[in-house]
């Protein structure tokens, strides 16, 4: 890994289990200043593997609201606008980090948690399962 | 929003700006126990809008490694295996939370940051831009 020289101005850690517990500033810095959400907002409808977005809410999690994609069809939309079943609409999934309140209902104490979310769908060619 | 009764066993917060700075346990809890990464590992190759994955590394960020998808073609792969340019391969993007070391090079102090990542690609029907 890369060794980082420690900044002498870092806060002290009184935690004996350091670095298991760290301080996190929740004032979110948004790096996405040059992106236009309008551009991709309708991909879910225009895709050959369209999807619906479902709201997943959990007050014990930060962020509390996550949108989950569910593919609309088993197959993919062809040039005629019909569903072709020799192709599969499949969800593209990504592992993301969220903060889980721990102990539960605590406003200022969290644990990092990895969850798998479906972001959208893509159209794939199925393959034959070759049995040995 | 939903009001959560506070757990009396919560850690105290000495921070006057509470809840801007919180304690986070970095021992990651993985909720993805029933998922098999084998399944989606080759979508990037089998998709009609295939993509390549590029490693984005930043030691000042947690997680330090993030994989970014870049669509291989402008168009989409058709039934004959050729690229059709009347359809567009587009990246599916998602805003995710990461931890940024703040002050820089500090091992136990972070700030939440939102970044936009491309997770994979999907094939969309282009739309005509109607000028008023």
């Amino acid at each position: 890994g890369i060794t980082i020289p420690r900044n002498p101005g870092c806060p002290n850690s009184e935690d004996k289990n350091f670095p298991r517990t760290v301080m996190v500033n929740l004032n979110i810095h948004n790096r996405n200043t040059n992106t236009n959400p309008k551009r991709s907002s309708d991909y879910y409808n225009r895709s050959t593997s369209p999807w619906n977005l479902h709201r997943n809410e959990d007050p014990e999690r930060y962020p509390s609201v996550i949108w989950e994609a569910k593919c609309r069809h088993l197959g993919c939309i062809n040039a005629d606008g019909n569903v072709d079943y020799h192709m599969n609409s499949v969800p593209i999934q990504q592992e993301i980090l969220v903060l889980r309140r721990e102990p539960p209902h605590c406003p200022n104490s969290f644990r990092l948690e990895k969850i798998l979310v479906s972001v959208g769908c893509t159209c794939v060619t199925p393959i034959v399962h070759h049995v040995a | 929003g939903i009001t959560i009764p506070r757990n009396p066993g919560c850690p105290n917060s000495e921070d006057k700006n509470f809840p801007r700075t919180v304690m986070v346990n970095l021992n990651i809890h993985n909720r993805n126990t029933n998922t098999n990464p084998k399944r989606s590992s080759d979508y990037y190759n089998r998709s009609t809008s295939p993509w390549n994955l590029h490693r984005n590394e930043d030691p000042e960020r947690y997680p330090s490694v993030i994989w970014e998808a870049k669509c291989r073609h402008l168009g989409c792969i058709n039934a004959d295996g050729n690229v059709d340019y009347h359809m567009n391969s587009v990246p599916i993007q998602q805003e995710i939370l990461v931890l940024r070391r703040e002050p820089p090079h500090c091992p136990n102090s972070f700030r939440l940051e939102k970044i936009l990542v491309s997770v994979g690609c999907t094939c969309v029907t282009p739309i005509v831009h109607h000028v008023a």
């Epitope: 088993l74 072709d84 079943y85 020799h86 599969n88 969800p91 | 098999n36 399944r39």
Partner: antibody, heavy 123, light 108 residues
Framework: EVQLVESGGGLVQPGRSLRLSCAAS????????MHWVRQAPGKGLEWVSG????????GYADSVKGRFTISRDNAKNSLYLQMNSLRAEDTALYYC????????????????WGRGTLVTVSS | EIVLTQSPATLSLSPGERATLSCRAS??????LAWYQQKPGQAPRLLIY???NRATGIPARFSGSGSGTDFTLTISSLEPEDFAVYYC??????????FGGGTKVEIK
């Protein structure tokens, strides 16, 4: 031995319900999408329903949509078909069939079949 | 909905003879057609998928051809165990597992 064994069939009155089960053995169950296909006495084959590896993709024939529910329990290597509001025309031998698609996806061809369980809907 | 029409309904042949079974689709299914064999009291068995690919363990005397709307299953030299009912099935359009009515190959 690689096999599929159906159970749960029987004689049932119109309008009533029945639950079919299919026990899989000899292969990694969650590597495959699974299906139910039926065959009325002396007739041809009719696809009823299919489900992918993690139940994220499910399909039904128009003739059973809204009445039948397919499900699976990967921990128990089992496939199920809950049949409600049964009709006389649902009388058939019900086969459990394994899809030949890789990664638990649909290919819509059936490489392994059970022996079937007979469902008779009659008053 | 695609309709698959198989012909003839019954084929009477002797062992050693060549069997030619036909399956016609009401609209193009490209090459996404499979063939199954079913013997009395048994479950169907996959023979051919994607028009011409033999499934695992299927003898070379079975072959498939065709694309679009017209498909053929050929058994080059009939063995006693080949007398059965044969079904074609498409996987292109909804419902994605439509079967033909079947062709019975019987001993002459």
């Amino acid at each position: 031995e690689v096999q599929l064994v159906e159970s749960g069939g029987g004689l049932v009155q119109p309008g009533r319900s029945l639950r079919l089960s299919c026990a899989a053995s000899g292969f990694t169950f969650d590597d495959y999408a699974m299906h139910w296909v039926r065959q009325a006495p002396g007739k041809g084959l009719e696809w009823v329903s299919g489900i992918n590896w993690n139940s994220g993709g499910i399909g039904y024939a128009d003739s059973v949509k809204g009445r039948f529910t397919i499900s699976r329990d990967n921990a128990k290597n089992s496939l199920y078909l809950q049949m409600n509001s049964l009709r006389a025309e649902d009388t058939a031998l019900y086969y459990c069939a394994r899809d030949m698609g890789g990664f638990g996806e649909f290919y819509w061809n059936f490489g392994l079949w059970g022996r079937g369980t007979l469902v008779t809907v009659s008053s | 909905e695609i309709v698959l029409t198989q012909s003839p309904a019954t084929l009477s042949l002797s062992p050693g003879e060549r069997a030619t079974l036909s399956c016609r689709a009401s609209q193009s299914v490209r090459s996404y057609l499979a063939w199954y064999q079913q013997k009395p009291g048994q479950a169907p068995r996959l023979l051919i998928y994607d028009a011409s690919n033999r499934a695992t363990g299927i003898p070379a005397r079975f072959s498939g051809s065709g694309s679009g709307t017209d498909f053929t299953l050929t058994i080059s030299s009939l063995e006693p165990e080949d007398f059965a009912v044969y079904y074609c099935q498409q996987r292109s359009n909804w419902p994605p597992a439509t079967f033909g009515g079947g062709t019975k190959v019987e001993i002459k």
